[in-house]
Structure formats: structure tokens, C-alpha cells
């Protein structure tokens, strides 16, 4: 009896694992083995596919074959018993195009209100992704074990920290990788769970902001308690992307070591131009807080994205705000030749309830105010360019009283 060729051959590639699956054409024929050949582009001859010769099952692994993953290959399969079937040719394919990204490895560390996530590719030193190792981004799904309500976080790098969590609470998460340059989305890692620690005695510093004054950066933060010392560390933001980088190391800013105020000043020129992360930690001599949330700090943007200056014209039921160019030292206006959007925050002086207006124009009306009431206003600028996506610090608050009724004209 003539053997039939196997049918429906599927090629599955996950990272550097190359798996072939196929269907037997004739289940009634026993003791059949299967063999594959492959052919590279531009070659006439077929070569035996090692790892896939005389296979008794309907699956084989040819990961050991050192292929150029960007080069198209063709496969063929036949069944063998006493005689052989005709060859069945599989559509040619390029391994890289066909490959899926496998589940990443995930390692978690718990703080009281944060989880540190270390992510690395599932296959170490992968041949498939050798040229793309630094292009991986990750996304994750996280949920409280008790509730199951999921939150998705997109576009993170290999070291990520999730803040604003509850102490002594179990959180679960799963992570998948993506290569956006190649339109590839990977498969999720197994679920990892971790319990946050007991609430720390000292909270981390909050509301960290960087501003520029007279060729210096001024770093300010808020803290709950007095009589503390603080330290500030920096890291080049690029290192967040690179999991295997042995140079990944947070370092101190000398001017900001053991400072006793909630600010420190360091010269603009100590950093080479680029994007950095900064973090602050508090200590009372006995206890130390966890590190603050990391803030991104771009020397190129920070150096020229200053808070706006503005004048207020007060009416009975509104403020007219006129925004001008910020001033450098020496009172000269800064020319900012890129589009800005302004965020204006205002509040009644006797209340904490803030309201917000976002405006592209430099003349803004703040409506629906009460007559003879003191309102305070602060503003900051944001770049409208998505690539830059930078913000100035807020200006100092300016407080003005609205006029008596019937002066809105």
C-alpha cells in the first residue's frame, strides 16, 4: 500500500525553540516514521533536518539547527515505513517573522506600598532577538489577590516600580514582552504573587520637583516630619531598559548627601546631557524610609522649560490671566520656540479644593468666581510634542481678590 504524505504541518517558533507539528495521513498504518529536509534560499539541494529524522511521534524540535533567522527557509516532510511517501512541501518562511516572544522571567521585591519588578527575556542570549534585546518593552496586568480587579500598565522597561499600593496586601501580576519595531507581542509569564510589607515608620519623600536657577538645578520635595536628613541618587534613564547591564547602579549626588533641608542645589554642568532618574530617601538617624517615586529629569528640556510668568486682571466673577515668557536670571525673557500648553490651577484661599484649566492660549479666563473672594493661582507649562512630553515646575502661587459684584464688563 502506498504511504500518504503527512499533512497540515505547523511551525511554531517561540524565542529560540523551533517546533514542528503535523498530522498523520493514515492513522491505520502503524510503525510509520517521519523525516524532514530543509532548503535555504538560493540553494537547490535539500539537507536533512537534524532532530527531525525518523521521528515516530508527530512533533519534533529543530532548535539545535543554527539558522540565520532572517533568511527564508523551506521544509518538506515524508512518511517512511518499508517504502516512503512522496514529499509534502511546507510553505517557505522566515524564522524571525514567524517567531513569537516567549514569556519573560519575572522577579518581584516588596516594599510597604510598592513592588519592584525585575523583568528579563525568557531566553538568555537569544539568537532570535540578538539584534533587538534593547528594544523589548513590557506590559503587565496587576490585581489585588483579594479583589481580582485588574489594572494594565503598558510600555514599561525591564526594571519597573509600582507605587501607591496598600501595605500587607497580596498582589498578583503577569508580564508579557513586545517588540514594537517588529509588531510582535509575546505571551504572558506565569502569574507571580507577592505580599507588601508592614507599613514603614518613615514614609518616603513626596512631590519631587526640579527647577533651574542661575545655572543650578534646584531639587525640592515634601516631607511629613522635621529634623530629618535626606539623600538623593541618580541613574541614567537608559539603564532601565537594559536588564543585563552590570553598570546599572544608582549613585549619590554629592551636593545632596545627608542634607537637612527638603531641597538641594547642584550645578547644571555636573550631568552630561541626557535623561536621568532621581530619587530621594529620608532618615532620622535610626530608621530609613523607602526611596521616593523616581522622577524623570531631562537636562536638555529642564534647562529651558521654566515655569510661566503671568499677570492677573481681577473682575467680580472671573480672572483674566495673561501668560508671558518666563524670566532668566538678569530678568531677560526666555525664548521657547516650541509649542506649549498651560496648566492653570486655582483655588479659593480658604479652601483646599483645586480646580484646573488646560489652555493653549496665553490669555485665559478663569470663570465662575465669587465676588470679593481671594483666589490663588499657579501655572506650569507642558511641551505639546509627544516625544518630549516635559513639564515645567509650577510657578509660585499668586493670590488676588475678586472685585465687588457687577464689574464683570
Amino acid at each position: 500500500k502506498n504511504l500518504k504524505s503527512p499533512q497540515k504541518v505547523e511551525v511554531d517558533i517561540i524565542d529560540d525553540n523551533f517546533i514542528l507539528r503535523w498530522n498523520r495521513s493514515d492513522e491505520s498504518v502503524g510503525n510509520v516514521t517521519f523525516s524532514f529536509d530543509y532548503q535555504k534560499t538560493g540553494m537547490d539541494n535539500w539537507i536533512k533536518l537534524s532532530g527531525c529524522q525518523n521521528i515516530t511521534s508527530t512533533k519534533c524540535n529543530f532548535s539545535s539547527l543554527k539558522l540565520n533567522v532572517y533568511e527564508e527557509i523551506k521544509l518538506r516532510i515524508r512518511a517512511e515505513k518499508e517504502n516512503t511517501s512522496s514529499w509534502y512541501e511546507v510553505d517557505s518562511f522566515t524564522p524571525f517573522r514567524k517567531a513569537q516572544i516567549g514569556p519573560p522571567e519575572v522577579h518581584l521585591e516588596a516594599e510597604d506600598k510598592a513592588i519592584v519588578i525585575h523583568i528579563s527575556p525568557g531566553t538568555k542570549d537569544s539568537v532570535m532577538w540578538a539584534l533587538d534585546g534593547l528594544s523589548f518593552t513590557y506590559s503587565l496586568v496587576i490585581w489585588k489577590n483579594s479583589s481580582g480587579v485588574e489594572e494594565r500598565i503598558e510600555n514599561i522597561y525591564s526594571r519597573h516600580k509600582i507605587y501607591k499600593l496598600s501595605p500587607e496586601t497580596t498582589y498578583c501580576l503577569k508580564v508579557k514582552a513586545a517588540l514594537l519595531t517588529s509588531w510582535k507581542i509575546g505571551v504572558y509569564s506565569p502569574v507571580h504573587c507577592i505580599k507588601t510589607t508592614v507599613e514603614n515608620e518613615l514614609p518616603p519623600p513626596e512631590n519631587i520637583e526640579v527647577s533651574v536657577q542661575n545655572q543650578n538645578y534646584v531639587l525640592k520635595w515634601d516631607y511629613t516630619y522635621a529634623n530629618m536628613t535626606f539623600q538623593v541618587q541618580w541613574l541614567h534613564a537608559f539603564l532601565k531598559r537594559n536588564p543585563g547591564n552590570h553598570l546599572y547602579k544608582w549613585k549619590q549626588i554629592p551636593d545632596c548627601e545627608n542634607v537637612k533641608t527638603t531641597q538641594c542645589v547642584f550645578p547644571q554642568n555636573v550631568f552630561q546631557k541626557g535623561i536621568y532618574l532621581l530619587r530621594v530617601q529620608a532618615s532620622d538617624g535610626n530608621n530609613t524610609s523607602f526611596w521616593s517615586e523616581e522622577i524623570k529629569f531631562d537636562t536638555e528640556i529642564q534647562a529651558f522649560l521654566l515655569p510661566p510668568v503671568f499677570n492677573i486682571r481681577s473682575l467680580s466673577d472671573s480672572f483674566h490671566i495673561y501668560i508671558g515668557a518666563p524670566k532668566q536670571s538678569g530678568n531677560t525673557p526666555v525664548i521657547q520656540d516650541y509649542p506649549l500648553i498651560y496648566e492653570i490651577i486655582f483655588w479659593e484661599n480658604t479652601s483646599n479644593a483645586e480646580r484646573k484649566i488646560i489652555e493653549k492660549k496665553t490669555d485665559v479666563t478663569v470663570p465662575n468666581l465669587k465676588p470679593l473672594t481671594v483666589y490663588c493661582v499657579k501655572a506650569r507649562a507642558h511641551t505639546m510634542d509627544e516625544k518630549l512630553n516635559k513639564s515645567s515646575v509650577f510657578s509660585d502661587a499668586v493670590c488676588e481678590k475678586t472685585k465687588p459684584g457687577n464689574t464683570s464688563k
Epitope: 534593547l134 537608559f238 551636593d255 547642584f266 555636573v270
Partner: antibody
Framework: EVQLQESGPGLAKPSQTLSLTCSVT????????WNWIRKFPGNKLEYMGY???????YYNPSLKSRISITRDTSKNQYYLQLNSVTNEDTATYYC???????????WGQGTTLTVSS | DIQMTQSPASLSASVGETVTITCRAS??????LAWYQQKQGKSPQLLVY???TLEDGVPSRFSGSGSGTQYSLKINSLQPEDFGSYYC?????????FGSGTKLEIK
Amino acid sequence: EVQLQESGPGLAKPSQTLSLTCSVTGYSITSDYWNWIRKFPGNKLEYMGYISYSGTIYYNPSLKSRISITRDTSKNQYYLQLNSVTNEDTATYYCARSGGMYYFDYWGQGTTLTVSS
Amino acid sequence: DIQMTQSPASLSASVGETVTITCRASGNIHNYLAWYQQKQGKSPQLLVYNAKTLEDGVPSRFSGSGSGTQYSLKINSLQPEDFGSYYCQHFWSIPPTFGSGTKLEIK
């Protein structure tokens, strides 16, 4: 392991243009900062400039009119060009890596340039 | 530019001794100071940055200290491999500048 290796002509005549190459292995020059530093015969060290991961450059103002630093990311190399060399440019030229502040944790072995007519 | 003055220009010491090299800046450099060791025919090696932080892999017999304009590098219990030249360098402003070096020789 990060390794840097300088290469260059060794000898140049006054007024010529000096071209040096720094080949980096074990690390991508699309991370961090890649500097040139030279050491004169009397052991004085001078900082020359850098090219960054993004291609941003900084030159020591004392050299600004004569210096150019470029890179080829596909070869993982960066380059120093110094125009109109004189005897005063006789030195050992080093390439070095920095991580964001101006101190240098990996250096090449150095290449010696002698300027002489 | 900030000038860095290093002293002594050279010193002789024996294995097991403790030596101190000093560096004075022409202005306050706020601890933005690095120390390097260079052996004959080799490239400089970073020992200390931020005036007192030891670079990974550097033996603990090396220590940096100082503040303002005055800084020092101390080597306890000198080893044969410690002989060579030492340079300080500030990175408080640009361009960064180096000291003129101290040559440490075996007595």
C-alpha cells in the same frame, strides 16, 4: 566586560588633520557617554570632549574650533578628528566611558601621537 | 576653569606603609572629585568618585576624604601593585580638569 581600544596613525606632520578611532566591545555606544582625553609628555591630562548615546556632543572650549567627535553605531566605534595639529598636540590619546557625570570608569590603552615635521 | 594642584609630585614608600596624596582645587568643588591610578604603560583606572565612594572592585585599603577645596587619597598598608601614578580630577564644572599627578615609587 566593557573594552575600549584606540587606533591611529602614530605620526603626523604639523597642519595635518589627526583622525583616531575608538572601538568599543562588550557594550553598546548607544548607551552612556564616550569621551576623549589626552595625556601630554609632561603627564598633564586634558579632557577633550564626548559624544553621547543619543549623538549629543560636548567639546572642551579650548579645542572647540579644531575638534570633531563622531560615531558609527553599526561598527560600535567613535572617532576623534583634530584639525591643524601642531607639536603641542603630541600626546597619548585615550578614549573612555562615563555614565552621566564627568568621571571615567573604563579607559582604552591609549594611542601615542607624535607631531613632527 | 578650576585648577587642581596635587602634592607631592612624587614620593617613595615601602610595602606595608600608609601614604596620603592631597589635591587642592582653586574653588569649592563640593565633593565632585575622582581619583585614578595609572601604572606604567597602562590606562588610568578609576579608584574613587564623589570624593569618598570606592569604585567597585577597588581594595578597601584605598580611601578618599575631604570637602570644599581640600581632598586626599589615603592608601593603608601599601602593596607592591599600588606603585604607579595617581591623579585627582574634579567634575564640578565643565571642562573637568585633572591634577598634575603624584608618582608613588618603591623605597
